[in-house]
């Protein structure tokens, strides 16, 4: 059986947010996958596809796993969007410098959509967010997903404030 060529993980950094878009590991490739997550300082991983591996080993390494699957090629539900943006806001506020990993099967559709939403909510224009991710992950997004992102109206939920209550547009290291 021909093995699918797995694209390398892609790190996307914007302001104080850091994401890792990655592929779907199998139980056989799990150890290498965990090594990669640790290398990037991942503390949370969001699985947006159906489970194909046991998360126990990942969680034993202190990485929090969330299962928020949605259909391939489709946009995420409003509930997933709300949960995702809340998670992003809290994680980067409470764990400065951390990294959130997101993966679907190949890391070309569902995962980049969630990352793009975070970038848009952080103040990036839709076109810039798409280009920014595509520069790193060629072939990301299908036409349905692009239309969804184009129509998405940000609520500016990720405009982080500094400790003095001012809008913070720079990276927190």
């Amino acid at each position: 059986m021909a093995r699918m060529n797995r694209p390398a993980p892609v790190e996307v950094t914007y302001k104080n947010m850091r994401f890792l878009i990655t592929h779907n590991p199998t139980n056989a490739t799990l150890n290498k996958f965990i090594e990669e997550l640790k290398k990037y300082g991942v503390t949370t991983i969001v699985r947006v596809c159906e489970a194909t591996y046991d998360t126990t080993l990942v969680e034993k390494e202190g990485i929090h796993v969330l299962d928020w699957p949605f259909d391939d090629g489709a946009p995420p539900s409003n509930q997933i969007v709300d949960d995702w943006l809340s998670l992003v806001k809290i994680k980067f506020r409470e764990e400065p410098g951390c990294c959130i990993a997101v993966h679907c099967v190949a890391g070309l559709g569902r995962a980049p959509v969630l990352v793009a939403l975070a970038l848009i909510e952080g103040g990036m224009k839709y076109e810039d967010a798409v280009q920014f991710i595509r520069q790193k992950r060629r072939g990301a997004f299908n036409s349905k997903q692009l239309l969804y992102l184009e129509k998405y109206r940000p609520k500016m939920r990720l405009r982080f404030k500094d400790s003095n209550g001012h809008r913070n547009n720079c990276c927190i290291q």
């Epitope: 998360t55 126990t56 969680e59 202190g62 929090h64 796993v65 969330l66 299962d67 509930q79 709300d82 949960d83 809340s86 998670l87 809290i90 994680k91 506020r93 409470e94 764990e95 400065p96 410098g97 400790s163």
Partner: antibody, heavy 115, light 90 residues
């Protein structure tokens, strides 16, 4: 707003088991770990363990591995902690806490173990 | 003005909370990530770090501040609490 409603005070006999609950509201229950913390009268706080409601994964403080069992029911957004083989040392207030890193806390459940 | 200090025995970065426990047992987080104030917490509370020492400072004490305070590290498992400080009126 985020809230945790813990079950009422428990009086139990040595050797028995109890199961207390923590009902979460105001956020999506599966998004964050649910931690449990013990406080003996006049003492400090001690971490017991957590459950990831999304996957069911649990992690325990070595000290409570054979004492506590954590479970969660996604449909009712409720976390549970069962304490077994009770002794007077288990008499304490037990707190649940979640939302990010211990962002909010339940009001506590008082457990009294007495014959 | 009063400062409470917690010393970390290993590197926890900025992963430290300060908690307040009232006499009725109610626990509330005041500070997260070493120095960020939780919403609704009065500005007289502040958090800081110097090396492995983490401090909670109350700039101007109010009567309701004379309760118990705990630090909590959430950098890695097992999560650990400081022994706690009871703030009392002289």
């Amino acid at each position: 707003q985020v809230q945790f409603q813990q079950s009422g005070a428990e009086l139990a006999k040595p050797g028995a088991s109890v199961k207390m609950s923590c009902k979460a509201s105001g956020y999506t229950f599966t998004s964050y770990r649910m931690h449990w913390v013990k406080q003996r009268p006049g003492q400090g706080l001690e971490w017991i363990g957590y459950i990831n409601p999304s996957t069911g994964y649990t992690e325990y403080n070595q000290k409570f591995k054979d004492k506590a069992t954590l479970t969660a029911d996604k449909s009712s957004s409720t976390a549970y902690m069962q304490l077994s083989s009770l002794t007077s040392e288990d008499s304490a207030v037990y707190y649940c806490s979640s939302y990010g890193n211990f962002g909010y806390w339940g009001q506590g459940t008082t457990l009294t173990v007495s014959s | 003005r009063v400062s409470l200090t917690c010393r970390a025995s290993q590197d926890i970065g900025s992963s430290l909370n300060w908690l307040q426990q009232k006499a009725d047992g109610t626990i509330k987080r005041l500070i997260y990530a070493t120095s960020s104030l939780d919403s609704g917490v009065p500005k007289r509370f502040s958090g800081s770090r110097s090396g492995s020492d983490y401090s909670l400072t109350i700039s101007s004490l109010e009567s309701e501040d004379f309760v118990d305070y705990y630090c909590l590290q959430y950098a890695s498992s097992p999560w650990t609490f400081g022994g706690g400080t009871k703030l009392e009126i002289k």
